[in-house]
């Protein structure tokens, strides 16, 4: 929607555009309007871009008006949220960015018979992108000055310069995404794909044998198992076997049988032969031991000379017996071969919670810090380690110690600074804790140990010109007498700034007002009205450009008044035989200086930009992807970092290219599967996945790698009549009309006779960007004056 908000109005005299007063007559003394003020309301008309604005023609983008929102002068800048001064024009089409705006201030007559009267009108042509920011515009000429602000905002869920890109955040089976500031979908954590409806499975989940419906999950296909579905399920009952595919049982080395449960190398697996016996595999799960001399039995476990092999460990002595041998162990050892260390910590001899460590034929106590000695029975002197930090002394106690702290310190080791800040500091001052003390840090404007004193900023008498000083916290305020302003009353108010006087009048500042000294042709408080000299003085035609009238303002007693036949853009030059020529201002030409010179003749707009002719100036409307005064700068489409997953961005014209890494694909390197998604090709283009790249087939009116560049085809052949300029707008176009023409294709002749230019009942004849007055009997001149 297009929004316009009236901010302020300044109509000092309460006058209308035609010089009359809004309500009643003028005071004969000071020429000011008497009686009531204007009842001011505003009308707005929004239409297609026009380089020379015409008042007539349809408001093709919408129109609206406010109720009466004030009198002669008012300021609504502070009244936020007041909708009376706001006009909202909704639009259901793509916003074309360029526009023409007509704003008119009107006086309501509050009367069914009397029509409303126009106070002032403003027009503005330009380009505006959708934004939450307001753009402030001013109307600073004529009888009234007013200020207003405009903005274009997209409806909810619509984005882009044309408000025609739709993105609605969602979190359901269709997708799980938010929308960024450009209306692109940004997937929620755990989701991927152009629609963000594909869950990102657990990292490592087999893409072949696992899948997921929810992020972080990994569901295995039949026959597969494991955290990542990458392990096949072997045949049920398979013992020493593996699988490469589900339900196999491929035997490990030295195993056989259908379930790999038969040991083909019993000797290697179990090593059953003892005492250096040699093992031979004789069949699945079968073996035979060949024993060395002195040993026998199926596993060579029987020793015929038992002590020969030194079976007693840890210096134990061996005795042969009828059953084999017997060991006599050295102190601290036990067991049939003296290999078990006797636990000397059972029972535990360590006192006061000491930990017992078993040694060979002995023990050692690891004591807690407060105890010492072989069995932790002696009290340790903790003061030897100097544990007290900020203390007068350290006293050793049984199983403890005591620190006598210095003032301001506490804690077992006197290492904690006592917090002396207990809310003594006033007026939001902060307190800094010191050792055995504190300091208040005062906020600006306060002093004293506890910040209890308000500093008197008025003590130095800072206010000038009789201003009264008011002391406040950390500041002062000057209340100024009439005629003075500024923070110190140092400024004499200058009612002449900005200059209210028009038409070159001199402004004089008074104590509480201003006075305009008007040149002879003008009158009114601001010298804004042309005097009707013919009311008072007869005048004489001098030549085809000049009339003379009696005047006491010139030494000769005569003053010369120039014709306005050359309009606002030229000066009249008299020629012989009652003829004249016009000297045109810069930017204008033609008999009456009515033609605006085409400043676009030299084609200054580059890179397919469209040139819009102004007055002695031009403006370039750039093709998509270009910006700058001459459309010379390629917009950096990489500025938003569109390439994901480490892709490198290369800027193109109104486009970008992502050089993807590590197997990522697609326009923005967001997909593992496909080069294409519905965002790859713009403006209805069809995307084709060509393996390493994508290709867009564009519909009519579009071209470029992603159908992002509008073809000029919508402007070929030129649909704009009467010299209008065609601006491509997607698959459509906008015409910027030459002066004198209006309408969507510049086919309607502007009514140059509006508002009535012919005086004294003269009849107006409308031409192409010109008019002619046919005067009533007794009147002459280009406007019958």
């Amino acid at each position: 929607q297009f929004e316009l908000e009236i901010l302020s109005m300044q109509n000092v005299n309460g006058e209308l555009q035609n010089g009359n007063c809004c309500g009643g007559a003028r005071n004969p003394g000071d020429r000011k309007c008497t009686r009531d003020e204007c009842d001011t309301y505003f009308k707005v008309c929004l239409k297609e871009y026009q380089s020379r604005v015409t008042a007539g023609g349809p408001c093709s983008f919408g129109s609206g008006s406010t109720p009466v929102i004030g009198g002669n002068t008012f300021n609504l800048k502070a009244s936020r949220g007041n909708d009376r001064n706001r006009i909202v024009l909704p639009f259901s089409f793509a916003w074309p960015r360029s526009y023409t705006l007509l704003v008119e201030a009107w006086d309501s007559s509050n009367d069914t018979v009397q029509p409303d009267s126009i106070i002032e009108k403003a027009s503005h042509s330009g380009m505006i992108n959708p934004s939450r920011q307001w753009q402030t515009l001013k109307q600073n000429t004529g009888v009234a000055h007013f200020e207003y602000q405009i903005r274009v905002t997209c409806d909810d869920y619509y984005y882009g310069f044309g408000c025609n890109k739709f993105c609605r955040p969602r979190d359901d089976f269709f997708g799980h995404y938010a929308c960024d500031q450009n209306g692109n979908k940004t997937c929620m954590e755990g989701w991927m794909g152009p629609e963000c409806n594909r869950a990102i499975c657990r990292q490592g989940c087999s893409p072949k044998h696992g899948s997921c419906k929810l992020p972080g999950d990994c569901r295995c296909q039949y026959g597969w198992q494991g955290l990542y579905c990458d392990k096949c399920i072997p045949h049920p009952g398979c013992v020493h076997g593996i699988c490469n595919e589900p339900w196999q049982c491929l035997c490990e080395t030295n195993w056989g049988g259908q379930l790999c449960d038969k040991d083909l190398n019993y000797c290697g697996t179990h090593q059953p032969c003892l005492n250096g016996g040699t093992c031979s595999n004789t069949g699945p799960d079968k073996y035979q031991c060949s024993c060395p001399e002195g040993y026998s039995g199926p596993n060579c476990e029987i020793a015929e000379h038992a002590c020969l092999s030194d079976p007693c460990h840890n210096r134990g002595s061996c005795k042969e017996t009828s059953l084999g041998f017997e060991c006599e162990c050295s102190p601290g050892w036990t067991g049939p071969t003296c290999s078990t260390n006797i636990d000397d910590c059972s029972p535990n001899n360590c006192s006061h919670g000491g930990t017992c460590q078993d040694l060979v034929n002995g023990f050692k106590c690891v004591c807690p810090p407060q105890w010492t000695g072989k069995t932790c029975q002696l009290d340790a002197n903790e003061c030897e380690a100097k544990p007290c930090v900020n203390a007068k002394s350290c006293k050793n106690l049984i199983a403890s110690y005591y620190c006598d702290c210095l003032p301001g310190w506490m804690g077992q080791n006197c290492d904690i600074n006592i917090n002396d800040c207990l809310g003594q500091c006033q007026n939001d001052a902060s307190c800094r804790d010191l050792v055995n003390g504190y300091r208040c840090i005062c906020p600006p404007g306060y002093a004293g140990d506890h910040c209890e004193r308000d500093i008197d900023e008025c003590a130095s008498n800072p206010c000038l010109n009789g201003g009264h000083c008011q002391n406040e916290i950390n500041r002062f305020q000057c209340l100024c007498p009439t005629g003075f302003s500024g923070n110190l009353c140092q400024l004499d108010i200058d009612y002449c700034e900005p200059n209210p006087c028009q038409n070159g009048a001199q402004c004089y500042n008074r104590a509480s007002d201003y006075f305009c000294k008007c040149p002879e042709d003008y009158e009114g408080k601001n010298c804004s009205h042309l005097k009707d000299h013919c009311r008072t003085t007869p005048c004489e035609v001098i030549d085809s450009c000049t009339v003379a009238m009696a005047s006491n303002d010139t030494p000769e007693g005569v003053r010369y008044i120039s014709s306005n036949v050359c309009g606002p853009h030229g000066k009249c030059k008299s020629q012989s035989g009652g003829k004249f020529t016009c000297d045109c201002n810069k930017g204008f030409t033609g008999t009456y200086c009515h033609e605006n010179i085409n400043d676009c003749e030299s084609n200054p707009c580059r890179n397919g930009g469209t040139c819009i002719d102004g007055v002695n100036s031009y403006k370039c409307i750039c093709s998509d992807g270009w910006e700058g005064a001459y459309c010379e700068t390629n917009i950096n489409d990489c500025s938003q970092n569109p390439c994901h997953n480490g892709g490198t961005c290369r800027d193109l014209v109104n486009d970008f290219y992502c050089d993807c890494k590590n197997g990522w694909k697609g326009k923005t390197c967001h997909s593992r599967d496909s080069q294409c998604d519905e965002a790859t090709c713009n403006n209805g283009g069809t995307c084709y996945d060509e393996g390493d790249a994508f290709k867009c087939m564009c519909p009519g009116g579009w071209e470029g790698t992603t159908c992002n560049i509008a073809r000029n085809s919508s402007c070929l052949p030129n649909p704009c009549h009467n010299g209008g300029t065609c601006v491509v707008n997607g698959e459509s176009f906008t015409c910027v009309c030459k002066e004198g023409w209006e309408g969507p294709i510049c086919a309607q002749n502007t009514n140059d006779c509006s508002p009535h230019p012919c005086y004294n009942s003269g009849t107006c004849v409308d031409g192409d960007n010109w008019y002619r007055c046919e005067c009533a009997p007794g009147f002459a001149g280009p406007d019958c004056r």
Partner: antibody
């Protein structure tokens, strides 16, 4: 007030075709996904199909895939379900539903009977 | 496909009773679960989506749960609450409903 009005149901022979319509009002139709859900006589609810706001994304239950086509006309605020190769097991009341994070509004339903 | 199982399939209760219906998903569905109420001859009506109460639904209805186990609770049963209740997962297609729980007058 959100309103959904289904039409186009009726009796059709097995193998025949039918086109259901759902006229929507009371909300911005083009901004919401839409769905069809059916309920066989005396049975529970079964999801049939859904379509995204602008129409490119369409989703179907396996039981109707290849036979049913969901579509929408945002300019007419209307949702459609084209049903071909109808079977006896397609007999049900068909509801259209506005779809955000759930089927938040339902029409009153239209009965489709497939019988020889 | 994600299977949704409701229990009990029917229950009898009196006005003022506190009623609890459970719904179990065959795999985790996070909090993507909706509850509907359907009266004979009428279209279903959304009660709760992802544990949030749909506007206009009385506060005696509440939903809880996450992952695979979910509960619909009616704090104090009213005469207009006698109906069939369905749960539905909304995370993955095909979208699936529970078989329904019929709440009857004791």
């Amino acid at each position: 007030e959100v309103q959904l009005l289904e039409s186009g149901g009726g009796l059709v022979q097995p193998g025949g075709s039918l086109r259901l319509s759902c006229a929507a009002s009371g909300f911005t139709f083009s901004s919401y996904a839409m769905s069809w859900v059916r309920q066989a006589p005396g049975k529970g609810l079964e999801w049939v199909s859904s379509i995204e706001t602008q129409g490119p994304t369409t989703l179907y239950a396996d039981s109707v895939k290849g036979r049913f086509t969901i579509s929408r006309d945002n300019s007419k605020n209307t949702l459609y379900l084209q049903m071909n190769s109808l079977r006896a097991e397609d007999t049900a009341v068909y509801y259209c539903a506005k779809t955000s994070s759930a089927f938040d509004y339902w029409g009153q339903g239209t009965l489709v009977t497939v019988s020889s | 496909d994600i299977q949704m199982t409701q229990s009990p399939s029917s229950l009898s209760a009196s006005v003022g009773d506190r009623v609890t219906i459970t719904c179990r998903a065959s795999q985790s569905i996070s909090s993507y679960l909706n509850w509907y109420q359907q009266k004979p001859g009428k279209a279903p009506k959304l009660l709760i989506y992802a544990s949030s109460l749909q506007s206009g639904v009385p506060s005696r209805f509440s939903g809880s749960g996450s992952g695979t186990d979910f509960t619909l609770t009616i704090g104090s049963l009213q005469p207009e609450d006698f109906a069939t209740y369905y749960c539905q997962q909304n995370v993955a297609t095909p979208l699936t409903f529970g078989q329904g729980t019929k709440v009857e007058i004791k």
